[in-house]
Structure formats: structure tokens, C-alpha cells
Interface confidence: low
């Protein structure tokens, strides 16, 4: 004796990404000489056994046997979501339901709000937005490989009533180390299956210059030629360099871009030299003590910031 359940068809719920393909499989143990049928959420018959009932080329027969009816729906749209019904026309009619969930793929995020030429210690505020996700996606921020804590993701329903637009903002105080950094907004969603979908915004940070003095050669002796290079750093890179010698009339003559040249060193060149590197962000003075009597000039540790 067959139990009543042997004539009860069974199926499973399916989740599919928009644009993908879903397979609906319905099985029954005892078909009682009846055919299986699939119908859509609008109660339109799709297949009755191996016979196509709806003219939709996206819907194809996968398998039709007395115990199984499997069909595939390709290029699935959001509108295809809903409960699909497998029926077997025994007495009484028995049915099984398959809930098809269609995931909306979030669009590549868009970053707005970047103001160019941020100054050090100013606050950068960036906004990120992505449309088309279903269910609503999550947005995350990072600076390089460091996570940034943006505000909670805001969710707004798209005009189609099915998908969502998500947005998030992040604010942080910039430092000189952030110059050239990439701020990345990533969208996280089950439809992406771990794939990266992100947008980056490279930021520029303006900061005050620093400078240091490098002798060439490193250990000059009396009678040698000496170049004192003034190496300025900053954004923008310092464009103006002024050399002074303590106790002398400023400024000293400069050659070879930012370098001070001594064609033939003598003891009277001994003393403390200062180089002021200037950009439109400010100035910085580095000092160097030159002792021609000593074959190893020692850079002083003092430097002055303006």
C-alpha cells in the first residue's frame, strides 16, 4: 500500500541573481498516471509534462519523466520573483510551492563630495551611493587597507519598487601621510558572491614643507669642492630655497637648483648654514654646521619651523 504522501509532489525554494538562470525541479513518488505541471506566480501554466504552455523562450524543459518535471528560466528578471506552483492532477489535485527569490545586483558605487587640495588637518567628507540592490546592500569604507568607519548605510527604495539605493558618508581628518591615498567605497551583497565591486577616490593633501641639508661629499676636507644640497619635501614641493650663513649678510648665492656650492673649501667657510625651503604652504629652515678643520662635518640637530 502506498501512503497518501507518495502522491504529494515536492520541490524547493530557489534564489537567483537577476540575469541568471534558475532551475525548478518537481518530483513525485507515485504519479498515479497523471502528469506534473509548473505554473508561474500569475497562475499561467508553463509546462504540462513535456508540453510547453507559455510562449517564453527563456523557459526551457530540462527533464520530463513520470516522476519528475524540471524546467529552467534564463535571463531571470526581478518581475519573475514569486511563488511557482508544481501541480499533479490526481484526485484530489496536489500541489507544491517553490518560492523564487531574485537578487538585484548593486551598481558600481559612485563617490561624490571630494574637494580637491585638502590641507593637512582639514576634514574630508565623502559620500558613496549604489543603486539596484535587492535586498539592500551594505557599504563599507577603507583608506588603503585601513577600515574607515562611515555612518550607517541609508536605504531608499528605487522607483521600480523592487530594488534599493544605499548610501553612506565618511568623514576623517587628513594628515600628510594621506597625500596620494585611495579612499575606497565597497558594496557588499550576496549577489556578488564575494566579488569586489568598489570605487576609489585618490586624495591630495597639501602640507607644509620640511627640509634637510645633505653635504656632497659627505666628509669634505679643506681644498675640496663641496655642495650643500637643500632637500625640501612637501606638497606642493618647495619651489624657493634661500641660504644664509650665521653672521654673514644674507642671502648667499645659490647654484644648481637648491644647492650651495663651495668650489674650493677653506677654513673661513666654517660656520652654521641655514636653508629655508618655501612653498605656498609655508617655510621650513634646516641648519647645518660645517667645520672645515674637522674632516667629518656634523649636521646639527636643530631646525626651525615657521
Amino acid at each position: 500500500n502506498l501512503s497518501q504522501d507518495d502522491s504529494q509532489p515536492w520541490t524547493s525554494d530557489e534564489t537567483v541573481v537577476a540575469g541568471g538562470t534558475v532551475v525548478l525541479k518537481c518530483q513525485v513518488k507515485d504519479h498515479e498516471d497523471s502528469s506534473l505541471q509548473w505554473s508561474n506566480p500569475a497562475q499561467q501554466t508553463l509546462y504540462f509534462g513535456e508540453k510547453r504552455a507559455l510562449r517564453d523562450n527563456r523557459i526551457q524543459l530540462v527533464s520530463s519523466t513520470p516522476h519528475e518535471l524540471s524546467i529552467s528560466i534564463s535571463n531571470v528578471a526581478l518581475a519573475d520573483e514569486g511563488e511557482y506552483t508544481c501541480s499533479i492532477f490526481t484526485m484530489p489535485v496536489r500541489t507544491a510551492k517553490s518560492l523564487v527569490t531574485v537578487l538585484g545586483i548593486p551598481q558600481k558605487p559612485i563617490i561624490t563630495g571630494y574637494k580637491s587640495s585638502l590641507r593637512e588637518k582639514e576634514t574630508a567628507t565623502l559620500n558613496c551611493q549604489s543603486s539596484g540592490s535587492k535586498p539592500a546592500a551594505q557599504l563599507t569604507w577603507r583608506k588603503g587597507d585601513q577600515e574607515l568607519h562611515g555612518d550607517q548605510t541609508r536605504i531608499q527604495e528605487d522607483p521600480n519598487g523592487k530594488t534599493f539605493t544605499v548610501s553612506s558618508s565618511v568623514s576623517f581628518q587628513v594628515t600628510r601621510e594621506d597625500d596620494g591615498a585611495n579612499i575606497v567605497c565597497s558594496v557588499n551583497h550576496e549577489s556578488l558572491k564575494g566579488a569586489d565591486r568598489s570605487t576609489s577616490q585618490r586624495i591630495e593633501v597639501l602640507y607644509t614643507p620640511t627640509a634637510m641639508i645633505r653635504p656632497e661629499p659627505a666628509h669634505p676636507r679643506e681644498g675640496q669642492k663641496l655642495l650643500l644640497h637643500c632637500e625640501g619635501r612637501g606638497n606642493p614641493v618647495p619651489q624657493q630655497y634661500v641660504w644664509v650663513k650665521e653672521g654673514s649678510e644674507p642671502p648667499l648665492k645659490m647654484t644648481q637648483e637648491s644647492a650651495l656650492i663651495f668650489p674650493f673649501l677653506n677654513k673661513s667657510d666654517s660656520g652654521t648654514y641655514g636653508c629655508t625651503a618655501t612653498s605656498n604652504m609655508g617655510s621650513y629652515t634646516a641648519y647645518f654646521t660645517l667645520n672645515v678643520n674637522d674632516p667629518s662635518p656634523v649636521p646639527s640637530s636643530s631646525s626651525t619651523y615657521h
Partner: nanobody, 124 residues
Amino acid sequence: QVQLVESGGGLVQPGGSLRLSCAASGRTFSNYARGWFRQAPGKGREFVAAIDYSGGSTNYADSAKGRFTISRDNSKNTVYLQMNSLRAEDTAVYYCAAPASRRPSWDADGYDYWGQGTLVTVSS
């Protein structure tokens, strides 16, 4: 955050060659200068070579001129140091460094980020 990883060191005979690599991660290092320094046992850290962000400007210590070549591949965020005609006095730990600026520097104080170093031993 910022990571510089050197590789390519090892044992080589005098007159031999090695190519060191320095891979960067954690920020867009292609826009910044990069330098190689070395530190021999019992000695201070010494400048070897530097290259600017574009690769258009390079500088070498006197001890490296004519034998060492610094280059960079910004698409891989990697800087290389090709070392030829190696001598016993080149034995040292070689460090890759990056400054937080677009200008190459020749002094260790001018660099903000440092790798862990790779050992180069020149010996017969």
C-alpha cells in the same frame, strides 16, 4: 597599513650579480620616491640609491655608481636594485624605504616607511 617587502637577497660569489625587489602595499606608492639603503654588520645605515616617482631621476652613492641600477615598475608597485660586480664590502642587510613625498631623498631621515630588510652576503 603600509608595507614594504624586500626579496632577492642571498649568498653570491664576488663578481656575481643579484636583483633585489621591493614590493609595496597599503597605499599608492607609485606616486612617491623610493630608496635603497644598506647596513653592514657593526656599521650605520648607508644610502645606496634612490629613484623618483616617475623613474626619470635616479641617484647613487659613490660606492654603487656603475655597478648598481635602480628601476621601478609602477604597474606592480615594485622597485628593483640590480647589483652587478658584487664585492665582499657589499655584504649588508639591504633596506627599501619610501618617503611621504614625491621627491627622492639621500638621507635616512627623509624616509617614513621601511621594509624589514634582505640580507646580501658576498663571499667565496
